[in-house]
Interface confidence: low
């Protein structure tokens, strides 16, 4: 097995100290909120302009409309992350021109073309997660190490739509090491 | 090079209306995510937020002296007003006006004017 | 409305000491914090924002850390141009500063 430090899961991304998961199946908001909790992260809390910028180019890149972290479901209106806190005032020039429009109860934010747009929360969307990246200061299961053959199994009655986050965590590593440098 | 400037007169008497201005250049309040803000700071005091405009207009005040405050710009002259009503001797501070930088996330405020020290008494 | 409590209120020190002030805030503020350097008869002058960021043109001798209630100033060797009153301001929910700190020569 090589000790080779690597900061994030198999398929994930990296940037400025965090690990992002771009799903390749869909789910609606909630279950996308379940999908991130089951692999240990959120779905993305966006913290600063580099990061909105970061993802906005993943999604916009690959035509997707795309769930992050973020709803008005507690109080019409009020925007609020995933973790608690508020969409502070200046991240609203991020929206759409016209957006948020709450049209039909959309109380749900995804990235849509160059920025941000509320849809139906029960609409299947493919969806970020966000967790910190490992520092490689012990061994975790980030080192580039062999995987274990079968993962295990999302928890009884979870759904599908996990397959993706799963799967990628099966590669070998010699794989992933060809493939990431 | 940006600048902020605030004007308004040096001394006020209690239960008038203070109108302090903030005069600026460098920037827009036109520019998307761009905002003015003022602040101020009584005499050996610590810092107090008093209310914040975005470009877009939206207001926002602080909870303690909102029904005293009223802020509005002009685009046009890079000018933002700061009006309070009811003055009091307790309202004798320094006045300054910043700015939150456009594309910031964070509402920080990293450029300030010099400040114009108001003194309520009759 | 969010509280901020900064300590010590003053901090006597030498040129050349490490000095660590802390900023503490009545709620989760996240890493929405910014730290503003202010000397006698002058405007606050931004340091640090986002808890860690430096502002461009800052000595790095200063930085921040900290998340949720808890943060951190330090001036890892104190200059005679450092001493000053350093606020701590939240954003996370409008706006608040706390009650400043006071860098005095010992």
């Known amino acids: 097995t090589e000790r080779l430090c690597h900061p994030c899961p198999w398929e994930w991304t990296f940037f400025q100290g965090n690990c992002y998961f771009m799903s390749n199946s869909q789910r609606n908001w909630h279950d996308s909120i379940t999908a991130c909790k089951e692999v240990g992260a959120q779905l993305v809390v966006i913290k600063s302009a580099e990061e909105q910028n970061f993802l906005q180019l993943q999604s916009s890149r690959s035509n997707r409309f795309t769930w992050m972290g973020l709803s008005d479901l507690n109080q019409e209106g009020t925007w609020q992350w995933v973790d608690g806190s508020p969409l502070l005032p200046s991240f609203k020039q991020y929206w759409n021109r016209g957006e948020p429009n709450n049209v039909g109860e959309e109380d749900c934010a995804e990235f849509s073309g160059n920025g941000w747009n509320d849809d139906k929360c029960n609409l299947a969307k493919f969806w970020i997660c966000k967790k910190s990246a490992a520092s490689c200061s012990r061994d975790e299961e980030q080192f580039l190490s062999p995987a274990p053959a079968t993962p295990n199994p999302p928890p009884a009655g979870s759904g599908g739509g996990l397959n993706d986050i799963f799967e990628a965590q099966k590669i070998e590593w010699h794989e992933h090491h060809h493939h990431h440098h | 090079q940006v600048t902020l400037r605030e004007s308004g007169p040096a001394l006020v008497k209690p239960t008038q209306t203070l109108t302090l201005t903030c005069t600026f250049s460098g920037f827009s309040l036109s520019t998307s995510g761009v905002s003015v803000t003022w602040i101020r700071q009584p005499p050996g005091k610590a810092l107090e937020w008093l209310a914040l405009i975005d470009w877009d207009d939206d207001k926002y005040y602080s909870t303690s002296l909102k029904t005293r405050l009223a802020i509005s710009k002009d685009t046009s002259k890079n000018q933002v007003v700061l009006t309070m009503t009811n003055m009091d001797p307790v309202d004798t501070a320094t006045y300054y006006c910043a700015r939150t930088p456009s594309g910031s996330y964070g509402r920080y405020f990293d450029l300030w004017g010099r400040g114009t020290l108001v003194t309520v008494s009759s | 409305d969010i509280q901020m409590t900064q300590s010590p209120s003053t901090l006597s020190a030498s040129v050349g000491d490490r000095v660590t002030i802390t900023c503490r805030a009545s709620?989760?503020?996240?890493?929405?914090l910014a730290w503003y350097q202010q000397k006698p008869g002058k405007a606050p002058k931004l340091l640090i924002y986002?808890?860690?960021s430096l502002e461009s043109g800052v000595p790095s001798r200063f930085s921040g850390s900290g998340s949720g209630t808890e943060f951190t100033l330090t001036i890892s060797s104190l200059q005679p141009d450092d001493f000053a009153t350093y606020y701590c301001?939240?954003?996370?929910?409008?706006?608040?500063f706390g009650q400043g700190t006071k860098v005095e020569i010992k």
């Open positions: 301001q939240q954003y996370n929910s409008y706006w608040t």
């Open positions: 986002e808890a860690s």
């Open positions: 709620q989760s503020i996240s890493t929405w």
